[in-house]
């Protein structure tokens, strides 16, 4: 009679995490008498997965009834598969011996690969805000997937980005893998409403990629443009000067009026108007009593935006062009954009 062979017909088996793996094994003969054992790996470290004779293997069930005398099917099912179960599984026939059974013949092995979904991509931007024309880096991370092959793409407002670097770790074999990508994005003044999207495609996702997003409103700082203008004379001795603060983001802004270098008033932007592109405009007035000044007045609108160094715009008020009243009030009157002063 021909010598017993252990047949493992499947060179490899691919199973999704959480599912059951079936590892097939048949023997070509009933002789010699002795049990079958299943191992993961070979050599000194091989791990016992199932022993027909003894032991407790809660995740393993046999496909056929191994107690039947003429049984030659030693296939097993392993339940609730995780990426940690990946490896090469060997079906090994033992010959009954005394005191111990002796290994007789091994199957060729079945490589179990586990498909595991990647975690939802997490996109993070720079710690500090940056201004238009600057390049900022965004990172995207996703973990726990298997097999290793994965595709990652970056988009800004639906347009695919090309300036990025991606690493999949580890390089060698592993139960599961992680992906880390860094994309470079050039900011524009119109990016307050923009989004950066990281898209991950993997065999486990069946063509429905996972996406992570970051809003550029968290990253961008659009500095304001200032314009100081002198309004027509409101009363005989009063001049209304306005400071238009335009196209800034975020809203955090503090404005200080200086008269000849001396602080006149400080206020915080409150009632702002929003532009279509997400930036803000704001206006502040200063009502100057020109009769209080003998010489020309240098008015400065100084703006501190989002904790950055102050920017300013000045306007020279020609006092000589206005009649002076003797003994008039020497203090300048100031008002905000939504205040009214009655004299």
């Amino acid at each position: 009679e021909e010598e017993l062979q252990v047949i493992q017909p499947d060179k490899s088996v691919l199973v999704a995490a959480g599912e059951t793996a079936t590892l097939r094994c048949t023997a070509t003969s009933l002789i010699p008498v002795g049990p079958i054992q299943w191992f993961r790996g070979a050599g000194p470290g091989r791990e016992l997965i199932y022993n027909q004779k003894e032991g407790h293997f809660p995740r393993v069930t046999t496909v056929s009834d191994l107690t039947k005398r003429n049984n030659m099917d030693f296939s097993i099912r392993i339940g609730n598969i995780t990426p940690a179960d990946a490896g090469t599984y060997y079906c090994v026939k033992f010959r009954k011996g005394s005191p111990d059974d002796v290994e007789f013949k091994s199957g060729a092995g079945t490589e179990l690969s586990v498909r595991a979904k990647p975690s939802a991509p997490v996109v993070s931007g720079p710690a500090a805000r940056a201004t238009p024309q600057h390049t900022v880096s965004f990172t995207c991370e996703s973990h726990g997937f298997s097999p290793r092959d994965i595709t990652l793409k970056w988009f800004k407002n639906g347009n695919e980005l090309s300036d990025f670097q991606t690493n999949v770790d580890p390089v060698g074999e592993s139960v599961s893998y992680s992906i880390h990508s860094t994309a470079k994005v050039v900011l524009t003044r119109e990016d307050v409403h923009s989004q950066v999207i990281c898209e991950v495609a993997h065999v486990t996702l069946q063509g429905d990629p996972l996406r992570g997003t970051a809003n550029l409103s968290e990253t961008i700082r659009v500095p304001p443009t200032l314009e100081v203008t002198q309004q027509p004379v409101r009363a005989e001795n009063q001049v209304n000067v306005t400071c238009q603060v335009r196209k800034f983001y975020p809203q955090r802004l503090q404005l200080t009026w200086l008269e000849n270098g001396n602080v006149s008033r400080t206020e915080t932007a409150s009632t702002v108007t929003e532009n279509k592109d997400g930036t803000y405009n704001w206006m502040s007035w200063l009502l100057v009593n020109v009769s209080a000044h003998r010489d020309d007045v240098k008015l400065t609108c100084q703006v501190e935006h989002d904790g950055q160094p102050a920017v300013s715009k000045s306007h020279d008020l020609k006092v000589s062009a206005h009649p002076k009243e003797q003994g008039s009030n020497t203090a300048a009157e100031n008002t905000g954009s939504n205040e009214r002063n009655i004299y």
């Epitope: 050599g43 470290g45 791990e47 016992l48 090994v92 290994e103 060698g172 074999e173």
Partner: antibody
Framework: DVQLVESGGGVVRPGESLRLSCAAS????????MSWVRQAPGEGLEWVSA???????YYADSVKGRFTISRDNSKNTLYLQMNSLRAEDTAIYYC???????????WGLGTLVTVSS | EIVLAQSPDTLSVSPGERATLTCRAS??????LAWYQQKPGQAPRLLIH???SRADGIPARFSGSGSGTEFTLTITGLQSEDFAVYYC??????????FGGGTKVEIK
């Protein structure tokens, strides 16, 4: 938590015998390969012997025929019977759990064997 | 028998710097290479297996790379607790399993 505790080390004369034990806990002992790795004073690591989950045994050439590895799965204990000891066997002997992929994921603290006349 | 040669024997590095350790195998080990850390008076500790898979609880500053016969362990931003001896081990051929001679990482 996986724990491996070696015992049985000591000072012996060349040619004498010693038996080391390794008590294991925190995992299903019978399912895993176990190994002995030694380290001579001031030297590197040297694999000595291993016993697979099925009881198959493996030895380094330097100890083959002199050392015998065995295990008692009912007691969760690994043994190393060392006969015909030589001065060059002087080392700390570590018990280690072997993964299915043949590296060592857990180690005991070791037991010192000194062979000296 | 697969012979593993580690270099350098000793590496002097300042805390915060990067350490690069090399392990060369006498034949292809198919990526089956592990790294261990051993501090004085202590047992070895598994850091990395299969070239680059970090063991449970090992910080990300430890990374492994390489293929074929040449492998590298990189420690970025060395911390005081990282000064130790590092060993490589091939887990491709178990007859016998072999270790490299070790690299001592010491404070510069």
């Amino acid at each position: 938590d996986v724990q491996l505790v070696e015992s049985g080390g000591g000072v012996v004369r060349p040619g004498e015998s010693l038996r080391l034990s390794c008590a294991a806990s925190g995992f299903t002992f019978r399912n895993y390969g176990m190994s002995w790795v030694r380290q001579a004073p001031g030297e590197g690591l040297e694999w000595v012997s291993a016993s697979s989950g099925s009881g198959s045994t493996y030895y380094a050439d330097s100890v083959k025929g002199r050392f015998t590895i065995s295990r008692d799965n009912s007691k969760n204990t690994l043994y190393l019977q060392m006969n015909s000891l030589r001065a060059e066997d002087t080392a700390i002997y570590y018990c280690a759990k072997v993964t299915w992929n043949n590296f060592f994921d857990y180690w005991g603290l070791g037991t010192l064997v000194t062979v000296s006349s | 028998e697969i012979v593993l040669a580690q270099s350098p024997d000793t590496l002097s590095v300042s805390p915060g710097e990067r350490a690069t350790l090399t392990c060369r195998a006498s034949q292809d080990v198919a990526g089956k290479l592990a790294w261990y850390q051993q501090k004085p008076g202590q047992a070895p500790r598994l850091l990395i297996h299969a070239t680059s898979s970090r063991a449970d609880g090992i910080p990300a500053r430890f990374s492994g790379s390489g293929s074929g016969t040449e492998f590298t362990l990189t420690i970025t931003g060395l911390q005081s607790e990282d000064f130790a001896v590092y060993y490589c081990q091939q887990h491709y051929d178990w007859s016998p399993l072999t270790f490299g001679g070790g690299t001592k990482v010491e404070i510069k």
